[in-house]
């Protein structure tokens, strides 16, 4: 067992918008981070994925219960010490997106392009409508590439 000494470690604090805030915290246990002290609070045990602390931990070391995140609205995908779950992503129709995999308590929503929309970047925050061809199609639109159109006056073989 490692000796108890104060060390700095990066620990994830999770806020209610579904976004992580990185804080440098001091831990008493160097091996497994079982004790966590930050913002004047002391947590002994993290909550598992899909749950959050029922309330903030207090200095006197009492251990709040872990309660589930709101199914379909919030999630946490790793063990953490926060009293807040992460907010599920919305797949915004106006950005050409739809839900591919629904949010669960332990996994954020996965979005994809709506039918007849495409996105050619690795991370898709916005999908564009597929081009409609006036003079015929060379290649159909896919989730990752736009339609390729024939030019006016070009012949089909």
């Amino acid at each position: 067992r490692l000796s108890s000494k104060s060390v700095n470690a990066q620990v994830t604090d999770i806020n209610s918008k579904g976004l992580e805030l990185r804080k440098t915290v001091t831990t008493v246990e160097t091996q497994n981070l079982e004790g966590l002290h930050h913002d004047g609070q002391f947590c002994h045990k993290p909550c598992p994925p899909g749950e959050r602390k029922a309330r903030d931990c207090t200095v006197n070391g009492d251990e709040p219960d872990c309660v589930p995140c709101q199914e379909g609205k919030e999630y946490t995908d790793k063990a953490h010490f926060s009293s807040k779950c992460r907010r599920c992503r919305l797949c915004d129709e106006g950005h050409g997106l739809e839900v591919e995999i629904n949010c669960t308590r332990t996994q954020n929503t996965k979005c994809r392009c709506k039918p007849n929309f495409f996105c050619n970047s690795t991370v898709c925050e916005h999908c564009d409508p597929c081009t409609k061809c006036e003079h015929g199609i060379i290649k159909e639109c896919t989730l990752t590439s736009n339609t390729k159109c024939k030019e006016e006056g070009s012949r089909s073989n």
Epitope: N15, K17, L19, R89, D92, E93, G94, H95, E125
Partner: antibody
Framework: QVQLVQSGAEVKKPGASVKVSCKAS????????MQWVKQAPGQRLEWMGE????????NYNQKFKGKATLTVDTSASTAYMELSSLRSEDTAVYYC??????????????WGEGTLVTVSS | DIVLTQSPGTLSLSPGERATLSCKAS??????????MNWYQQKPGQAPRLLIY???NLESGIPDRFSGSGSGTDFTLTIHPVEEEDAATYYC?????????FGQGTRLEIK
């Protein structure tokens, strides 16, 4: 086009309640969360809370819990915000706004014209 | 709560000049390389109007005289060239953490 039309100005006595409506048109009402924002005279805008019209799930700013109640009537594409136990500090313009999500950044792209609520004895 | 402080309080410029509006957050509003900052314009007696979302994305229908930049705790809205119709109050707003908060506003006057 996308539009949010709010109910008219209200004058209320302290202790009373008021219900402000926000009728949406030009888009699928249940596809976008609705936000509510307060603007008191000479104060910065304050986010009050939000509602998901698809299932009436609500999320409030802690400051407005117990003060504001958000509801929707999906058949009428209308969101409501009720303020209870009115006090002079509730005098403000209240806005509804449509929520958008750009990779978990939530923003308000269309706003109602605002409803002035005046609390006066 | 995350506090947003805007400066200057009032800016007075002539048409054609460059307006630089600042918004500083009390803690970072970034996550995973993205900045959760939005900008709105409000004219007297009107509702706010979205200009910029996610720090630098121009809302559809907004002239490209408007641009947003910044990350972490420091953000800027730039208007160039300024036009008479830009006279308004401009608000920044963060959505990195609940409660979502707004700055106190910068008033832009056109000489």
């Amino acid at each position: 086009q996308v539009q949010l039309v709010q109910s008219g100005a209200e004058v209320k006595k302290p202790g009373a309640s008021v219900k402000v409506s926000c009728k949406a048109s030009g888009y699928t009402f249940t596809s976008y969360w609705m936000q509510w924002v307060k603007q008191a005279p000479g104060q910065r805008l304050e986010w009050m809370g939000e509602i998901d019209p698809s299932d009436s799930y609500t999320n409030y700013n802690q400051k407005f819990k117990g003060k504001a109640t958000l509801t929707v009537d999906t058949s009428a594409s209308t969101a409501y915000m009720e303020l209870s136990s009115l006090r002079s500090e509730d005098t403000a313009v209240y806005y509804c706004a449509r929520n958008r999500d750009y990779s978990n950044n939530w923003y308000f792209d269309v706003w109602g014209e605002g409803t002035l609520v005046t609390v006066s004895s | 709560d995350i506090v947003l402080t805007q400066s200057p309080g009032t800016l007075s410029l002539s048409p054609g000049e460059r307006a630089t509006l600042s918004c500083k957050a009390s803690q970072s509003v970034d996550y995973d390389g993205d900045s959760y900052m939005n900008w709105y314009q409000q004219k007297p007696g009107q509702a706010p109007r979205l200009l910029i979302y996610a720090a630098s994305n121009l809302e559809s229908g907004i002239p490209d005289r408007f641009s947003g930049s910044g990350s972490g705790t420091d953000f800027t809205l730039t208007i160039h060239p300024v036009e008479e119709e830009d006279a308004a109050t401009y608000y920044c707003q963060q959505s990195n953490e609940d409660p979502r908060t707004f700055g106190q506003g910068t008033r832009l006057e056109i000489k």
